[in-house]
């Protein structure tokens, strides 16, 4: 069991308080983390609490302000970048969200050595993206879908394509879709590592089917919102690599980087771009049916101005038993001969490891082995490989850091974290200075957490950079719930649970239980983590108790469990909330009458699924913008799980699998249904269909809609849904106000 | 405006090398905003790309005459050079230099044109 | 290299007539394909760049479209002055390279 924070003596109980429902939306029990700006290996930039940027040298000691708050204030900058030679800054204003990663803004470029703002052949706004070159102070941003270089932030703007075109063609930025399921990125250009070249991808979306909805807004008349999106089996976008020479951009124009012919054959996606020298580049291809991928290295060949991709630097990636990689196809950490690299994938043994790879995959040397999985390569120096997993102890829900002295054989391997708070660190990242020199651990609990600064060499702390003592005094005399994270084995499965326990938990007491479940394809929910969330409020004054589940299909515990779930979405995830609901009832501190499930996104279509399942077992439930039908959902997430909507695919199961085929089964449970009519991810035709499906049934169910609010319902928003979602649940558990 | 002239020898032997000179009038080669270019046109045949260079010396020229071809610029003089070596009788063309704005824009502005004539 | 492949050869009108001029790559060119004209005896004229924009001065009778590997270069309504051998040009992969020509030749 994970106390959090240490307990103050029976005697001050008195004056120890619950957790309000106004904490946690006021949200007052927030933390804070540390992540170093690194401008060099020994430098980093951090905005300080008053908002000036502050320039830190770890081996001298000294700090001093590089941008006052006064200047960021000027231009009302929220968001900032130093150019590498140090001789400009971006500011950023009027941030406008888009989606997940997407924003415009508006930048203003100041220059460090005359104090004063670059005036003449100023940036153009909204723009898109906008970053500097690795090296000097070249720009690169994005513009009304097109991309523009300038060589210097004062000098006019060159023009690298013009074919840009809102909601066809997208250059340099990712359209809905690669955003949102493949580059988790805002931006869709990569700078090689010197700067000389500027690689680049072209979404054409000409022929996307597109979602449209509206924005209420404020006018008499409510807005149309177009996005091209693919749903499952849809029309995809075609996708093209560029690569442009940035020293003379106007003459040669953008190469394009040839697609592997084995990808080629049929539809498929760019996955990702690694730059490995200036005249190197790696390029990722995944087929449409995701479980063959395809890692192409390219050299410049300067004769023809050509991005030449030999068949023998082409490495196939191919799974037999799911879909290829974890969420991700995972990308490459190449060496420092430019040619051999290091990536997670399966292992024989169905576990995701770190690989060398010199010559081909099939040669590959394996790194890191065991029946736990290696997660991230953080970085790898000359003699050392740094990484995360969860190996220790055995707790998939724990990442600690690791270091792997290649430069040595055989190679030696030590845990940089496990030791240095194990109560309260369990779960870290890190960051890391160039040549890994320092890094900083950032560590997320299960106790407070806490960021702190270490030798690259030794592995020393050298100092903490935030431990968020204000939230240790706030949280001491609060009553927060017991934690703890335990598994169940059935049927050859092993359930992971964390369990939320209020207070003055008695075993000898019965208990309302709420599952929390979210269960999506490589997702993890118990893990060892810091949080006073609304569950948490749930547990310490409402008296529930509150479990979360890891059921097949969620990751980390290898590919047995992972892909467990390929092509029969909806059935296993479901499945193993149930069985775990029964081992919780079995251990006799439940209060069988009285269990709720609920979830949001994926969660709210395996809680649907699971009040439908005619079990019996839950007497409410909630979904929060749940998927409905997989039909309904993007081709790239979709597809990598179920296949195609197709007679000779799997048209069947995507038809088997929907709410909506389940609403006779809602009549004996009390179902709340919510969703944002602005939801640009999990349209809200989403809810209507399985509302309609409810009506159709003549079912009873509560519903509540949030009138122009995304997939995230935020703002305003969140504190009516946590109000509203409480008030329903404290009804189904006769729990008084 | 802008305009481009050819000039050099109009006869040159085989195994020689070819030399010829474009004078910019109307624009300034140093004020790097084109490339200068280099075409030309064998007796009753279509166009061939020769190469192209910019103010700072960087030249791009077509792989099957590379080590052939040298370009270089004098910026002093306003004027782009062209040398091309071991000429035989496949060189014998009509050759033209051109003001250069790249892939986008292309080649705008046009010389004359030259004739060379490789004949012992 | 990619091969530009123009279509016809030679192209027989009267003036007042439409001319339609075809220039096929081997391989996607995007958009970045120019024509040009020649007269006999002198130097090529930019006539379209980007595929289908009109360089300065040049008369709105010119127009150019098509993306990938297929462009045409259309005349609406020919002038005798109209009369020449018509080049496109590709830029998108290296080297730069030329169609054989289309000679349009008065009727």
């Known amino acids: 069991i994970v106390l959090r924070p240490s307990r103050v003596h029976n005697s001050e109980e008195n004056t120890m308080r619950a957790l309000t429902l106004k904490d946690i939306l006021n949200g007052t029990f927030s933390y804070k983390t540390f992540f170093p700006n690194w401008i060099s290996g020994q430098e980093y930039l951090h905005q300080s609490a008053d908002n000036n940027i502050v320039l830190y040298n770890i081996e001298t000691g000294q700090s001093y302000t590089i941008l006052s708050n006064r200047t960021m204030k000027s231009v009302n900058a929220s968001n900032y970048g130093l150019s590498p030679d140090r001789q400009f800054v971006y500011l950023e204003s009027d941030y406008s969200k888009l989606w997940r990663y997407s924003y415009t803004a508006t930048y203003y470029i100041y220059d460090l050595s005359n104090g004063e703002f670059v005036r003449g052949n100023e940036l153009p706004r909204p723009i898109q993206y906008l970053c500097w070159s690795p090296v000097g102070s070249k720009l690169a941003y994005v513009y009304q879908n097109n991309i523009y270089l300038k060589q210097r932030p004062g000098d006019p703007p060159f023009q690298i394509t013009f074919n840009g075109r809102e909601n066809k063609i997208f250059n340099g930025i990712p359209d809905w879709v690669y955003e949102e399921e493949m580059l988790a990125t805002k931006y869709a250009l990569w700078w090689s590592p010197n700067g000389k070249f500027l690689a680049y991808a072209e979404f054409n979306d000409t022929d996307i089917p597109v979602i449209a909805y509206s924005y209420y807004g404020d006018e008499q008349y409510p807005r149309t919102i177009n996005i091209p999106y693919p749903k499952a089996g849809a029309k995809n976008p075609v996708v093209r690599i560029f690569i442009i020479d940035t020293t003379y951009p106007a003459y040669v124009g953008p190469q394009e980087v040839p697609v592997p012919a084995m990808i080629a054959s049929s539809d498929y996606y760019f996955s990702w771009l690694t730059w490995v020298t200036d005249e190197r580049v790696c390029l990722q291809w995944l087929k449409r049916v995701q479980n063959v991928s395809v890692l192409s290295i390219c050299d410049f060949r300067e004769d023809w101005q050509t991005w030449d991709c030999p068949k023998t630097q082409e490495h196939i990636e191919e799974s037999r038993t799911g879909w290829a990689g974890g969420f991700f196809v995972s990308t490459p950490v190449f060496s420092y001969d430019a040619i051999s690299y290091y990536k997670i994938f399966s292992d024989k043994d169905g576990y995701k490891h770190i690989h060398y790879i010199k010559d081909t995959v099939e040669n590959a040397i394996q790194i890191t082995s065991g029946k736990w999985e290696a997660i991230n390569i953080f970085r790898v120096t000359q003699d050392s490989l740094f990484y995360s997993s969860n190996e220790f102890e055995e707790y998939p829900g724990r990442r600690n850091i690791y270091r792997i002295s290649i430069g040595s054989y055989p190679p030696s391997k030590k845990c940089v974290t496990c030791h240095l708070r194990k109560e309260r660190c369990q779960y870290y990242t890190a960051s890391f200075s160039d040549y890994a020199k320092y890094y900083a651990l950032v560590c997320y609990g299960p106790g407070i957490p806490i960021s702190t600064l270490h030798d690259g060499r030794t592995d020393q702390e050298i100092k903490i950079l935030e431990e968020n003592k204000e939230l240790e005094n706030a949280l001491k005399n609060i009553q927060l719930p017991k934690e703890e994270i335990k598994k169940l084995e059935v049927d050859e499965i092993t359930l992971w649970y964390k369990m939320i326990l209020p207070p003055q938990f008695d075993r000898s007491k019965k208990y309302p239980l709420l599952i929390q479940v979210y269960g999506g394809p490589c997702s993890q929910s118990v893990r060892s983590v810091f949080a006073v969330n609304w569950i948490s409020y749930l547990a310490s004054k409402e008296g529930m108790v509150i479990a979360l589940v890891d059921g097949r299909g969620t990751a980390f515990q290898g590919d047995k469990l992972l892909y467990a779930v390929y092509r029969k979405l909806g059935v296993y995830e479901v499945e193993d909330q149930i069985t775990a609901v029964r081992k919780f009832i079995e251990m006799g501190f439940i209060d069988e009458k009285r269990i709720a499930i609920w979830g949001w996104s994926y969660g709210g279509y395996v809680s649907s699924l699971a009040l439908a399942s005619g079990t019996g077992l839950f007497k409410c439930g909630i979904a929060v913008a749940p998927v409905s039908s997989w039909e309904y959902y993007a081709s790239v997430y979709t597809e990598r799980f179920m296949g195609l909507p197709t007679k000779d695919d799997n048209l069947e199961h995507y038809k088997n699998s929907t709410v909506m085929a389940r609403a006779e089964y809602f009549r004996n449970v009390d179902y709340l249904l919510i969703h944002g009519t602005a939801d640009d991810n999990v349209h809200f035709q989403n809810s209507a269909q399985i509302a309609k499906a409810l009506v159709n049934a003549q079912v009873d169910f509560q519903a509540m809609w949030y009138s122009d609010q995304n997939h995230g319902l935020s703002g305003l928003s969140t504190n009516h849904l946590y109000t509203h979602m409480t008030h329903f649940l404290k009804q189904c558990f006769s729990l008084s106000d | 405006q802008v305009q481009l002239q050819e000039s050099g020898p109009g006869l040159v032997k085989p195994s020689e090398t070819l030399s010829l000179t474009c004078t910019v009038s109307?624009?300034?080669?140093?004020?790097?905003?084109?490339?200068w270019g280099w075409i030309r046109q064998p007796p009753g045949k279509g166009l061939e790309w020769i190469g192209s260079?910019?103010?700072?010396?960087?030249?791009y020229h077509d792989p099957s005459l590379k080590n052939r071809v040298t370009m270089s610029v004098d910026t002093s003089k306003n004027q782009f050079s062209l040398r091309l070596s071991s000429v035989t009788a496949a060189d014998t063309a009509v050759y033209y230099c051109?003001?250069?704005?790249?892939?986008?824009?292309?080649?705008?502005?046009w010389g004359q044109g030259t004739t060379v004539t490789v004949s012992s | 290299e990619i091969v530009l492949t123009q279509s016809p050869a030679t192209l027989s009108l009267s003036p007042g007539e439409r001319a339609t001029l075809s220039c096929r790559a081997s391989?996607?060119?995007?958009?970045?394909l120019a024509w040009y004209q020649q007269k006999p005896g002198q130097a090529p004229r930019l006539l379209i760049y980007?595929?289908?924009n009109r360089a300065t001065g040049i008369p709105a009778r010119f127009s150019g479209s098509g993306s990938g590997t297929d462009f045409t270069l259309t005349i609406s309504s020919l002038e005798p002055e109209d009369f020449a051998v018509y080049y496109c040009?590709?830029?998108?992969?290296?080297?730069?390279?030329f169609g054989q020509g289309t000679k349009v030749e008065i009727k």
């Open positions: 980007d595929a289908s």
């Open positions: 040009q590709q830029r998108s992969n290296w080297p730069p390279t």
């Open positions: 260079i910019y103010s700072s010396g960087s030249t």
């Open positions: 051109a003001r250069d704005r790249g892939y986008y824009y292309n080649m705008d502005v």
């Open positions: 109307g624009d300034s080669i140093s004020s790097g905003s084109y490339y």
């Open positions: 391989q996607s060119v995007s958009s970045y």
